[in-house]
């Protein structure tokens, strides 16, 4: 018996087609992805093959103005239209709190939404009961297939699930649910979830009875043969893990942003054992036409987005200096504003010993692309912020050793004075540079804001200590020459859309007046620029 698994993960609000790098589509003939194009391909496969499941491994939420405006209603609507068979909860599904998950998505989805390792307690238990499930048995042709869901147990640090959801260890939570499926005589079981490729492989190895793992969170691109676009494969598709009980378990993921549709064919014997598995992600490029009816629906929903982007979010009573003449040479108040917003977006009081789990932010000055003039009645709109942050990136959470941070700050000024983008803006960090010293030895003071304290204060950076830092995904991926971050990071979790983070902060504050306040200093009285 043959099953075709179609899968997406980490789509992050890319409902419309995008450019090759998953930013805004400019030249339509070169654009990729989007739900209209995805639907064309899915329908083509459904018509051609008998037993097809379309699965999503989480993080549909967060990433473009679509989510900012529609808050998840767009996810339910278009996933229903595409007839997804099941979805696992990702960490970003909790970005607007539990209510922001329940009302727009859990109550509106016409398909099962799954997670076996999230347990509700207190008053939430009855409110959310039945709205998501640990597993779902799906009828596929004359057979049944069990889908068991899982979600990153780091979600309380990455999003806003509140205090009434407990995120258990994935493997511990999955095993009894898989066992329960076995007692229901379900002998073909897919683990569908959002904990990253390393955990996907562990689940394949450790959870007895799981036949296939379909994952997300780490944006992992797997491919067999010559890859069709810019993504470099982390391994073959499917990635085969030998389980502790000796079975070959295929593990798949489909990069991110709806650029690819995962396509995996599994052959089962009559006892539900995997005989063979093969496939590859399908690049959703312009050779695949956009479905006209879905496209028309997208265009209808789009109208509200254009209206939103010109509405006032809040006001500034000071000039927001995002000029390259400032942000690439010295502390600029636009950099301070953005870093303050990044920290504010990551406030999670999950431990009494810590005022917050993260206090530091770094931001490449080259990522700040425009100032905002306060002499327009002080008005700040989404459109204004899109000019400041036009690349459609995210502000991510990483864990780094102090020594890596020191290298990053040395890199920040290694060729100072050439208006290059690597000059770092900061939050929760006080840095002093001495530009008279040779490159690689210019950081003379680096103090960081404590987290395990009731009164936050600045202490010298410790080289061997592990620190959490919020930074743009561009830096986490080694952009602007920050190879040491990419090479040495100990953990990397994708965060919220950059513009959304700043817009939410401005809306919350109502009136802003960021200052230049001595976060970045130069010793030896260097007056540059």
């Amino acid at each position: 018996w043959e099953l075709t698994i179609l899968h997406t993960n980490d789509v992050h609000s890319r409902l419309e087609q995008t450019s090759e790098d998953s930013s805004k589509c400019v030249n339509a003939s070169r654009c990729m992805g989007g739900v209209a194009r995805l639907f064309t391909k899915v329908q083509q496969i459904r018509r051609a093959e008998p037993n097809v499941l379309l699965l999503d491994a989480g993080d549909q939420y967060q990433g473009t103005i679509w989510f900012t405006v529609y808050k998840g209603a767009e996810v339910a609507h278009f996933m229903n239209a595409l007839r997804y068979d099941a979805m696992a909860l990702g960490n970003h599904e909790f970005d607007n709190g539990v209510e922001g998950l329940i009302e727009p998505l859990l109550k509106e989805a016409k398909f099962p939404i799954l997670s076996a390792n999230i347990k509700a307690k207190g008053p939430l238990a009855s409110q959310i009961s039945g709205l998501y499930l640990p597993y779902k048995v799906l009828p596929v042709g004359d057979e049944v297939v069990g889908i068991v869901g899982y979600t990153s147990k780091e979600t309380p640090f990455l999003s806003n699930p509140g205090t009434n959801l407990v995120f258990e260890d994935e493997i511990t939570a999955l095993q009894p649910e898989v066992d329960k499926l076995k007692t229901l005589n379900v002998n073909k079981i897919i683990a569908l979830g959002h904990s990253g490729f390393e955990m996907d492989k562990l689940i394949a190895q450790k959870v007895r009875g799981v036949d296939v793992v379909v994952g997300g969170h780490s944006n992992t691109f797997l491919y067999t043969g010559n890859p069709p676009s810019k993504e470099v494969p982390a391994g073959k598709y499917p990635f085969i893990v030998t389980s502790d009980d000796g079975r070959k378990v295929p593990v798949v993921q489909a990069y991110a942003f709806g650029k690819y549709l995962g396509y995996l064919k599994i052959e089962f014997d009559e006892r539900g054992n995997v005989i063979s598995s093969h496939g590859n992600p399908i690049l959703l490029n312009s050779s695949i036409p956009e479905d006209p009816s879905i496209k028309a629906d997208i265009n209808k929903w789009r109208i509200k987005l254009d209206n939103y982007s010109t509405q006032e979010l809040g006001k500034t009573i000071v000039y927001l200096d995002g000029s390259s003449q400032s942000c690439r040479f010295r502390e600029c108040n636009m950099g301070n504003l953005i870093c303050d917003a990044m920290i504010n977006n990551n406030l999670r009081h999950t431990d009494e010993m810590f005022w917050n789990h993260v206090s530091m932010c770094i931001l490449n000055g080259g990522g700040i692309r425009s100032p905002i003039d306060e002499r327009n009645n002080g008005t700040i709109t989404w459109e204004n912020l899109a000019a400041v942050l036009p690349f459609g990136g995210t502000f991510d959470l990483v864990q780094l050793k102090g020594s890596t941070l020191k290298k990053a700050f040395e890199h920040s000024v290694h060729r100072y004075g050439q208006s290059t983008g690597e000059f770092l803006q900061v939050g929760g960090i006080h840095v002093v540079y001495d530009l008279s010293r040779k490159p690689g030895d210019r950081v003379v003071k680096l103090d960081v804001l404590c987290t395990k304290c009731r009164v936050p204060s600045y202490d010298p950076l410790k080289m061997d200590e592990v620190y959490k830092v919020i930074l743009p995904n561009f830096l986490a991926n080694g952009g602007d020459g920050f190879q040491m971050i990419k090479d040495e990071l100990l953990r990397h979790d994708s965060g919220d859309q950059d513009i959304n983070v700043v817009s939410t902060y401005i809306s919350k504050m109502k009136v802003i007046y960021p200052a230049v306040e001595g976060r970045i200093k130069f010793s030896h009285h260097h007056h540059h620029h």
Partner: nanobody, 124 residues
Framework: QVKLQESGGGLVHSGGSLRLSCAVS????????IGWFRQAPGKEREGVSC????????NYADSMKGRLTISRDNAKNTVYLQMNSLKPEDTAVYYC?????????????????WGQGTQVTVSS
């Protein structure tokens, strides 16, 4: 809390009719496919009928085709099963079940929520 409650069962003579109701609470009915099942003493539970979440698709067991009509009233959060020309072999406990999914199925395992059942007895 999700709850399904069957009613309308009872004792009926061969050739008679019954209308079973399945009242659901704790969720909006229009997102759920509802199935009717029956279990006679000493036998496996078997699918009788089903109506998809959109209401556009219905299924009937071969053994009862032409004698059943399934319908749903989303406003009342209730699904009905009209059973005509009943036979003694239709005697069983009738259950309704719900699953959040688009498609009908007669497979017991795919349904997530079940009612307690209502007894239907057809005398000759």
């Amino acid at each position: 809390q999700v709850k399904l409650q069957e009613s309308g069962g009872g004792l009926v003579h061969s050739g008679g009719s019954l209308r079973l109701s399945c009242a659901v609470s704790g969720f909006a009915l229009d997102y759920y496919t509802i199935g009717w099942f029956r279990q006679a003493p000493g036998k496996e539970r078997e699918g009788v009928s089903c109506i998809s979440s959109s209401g556009s698709s219905t299924n009937y067991a071969d053994s009862m085709k032409g004698r059943l009509t399934i319908s749903r009233d989303n406003a009342k959060n209730t699904v009905y099963l009209q059973m005509n020309s009943l036979k003694p072999e239709d005697t069983a406990v009738y259950y309704c079940a719900a699953q959040r999914y688009y498609y009908c199925s007669d497979k017991v395992a795919v349904y997530d929520y079940w009612g307690q059942g209502t007894q239907v007895t057809v005398s000759s």
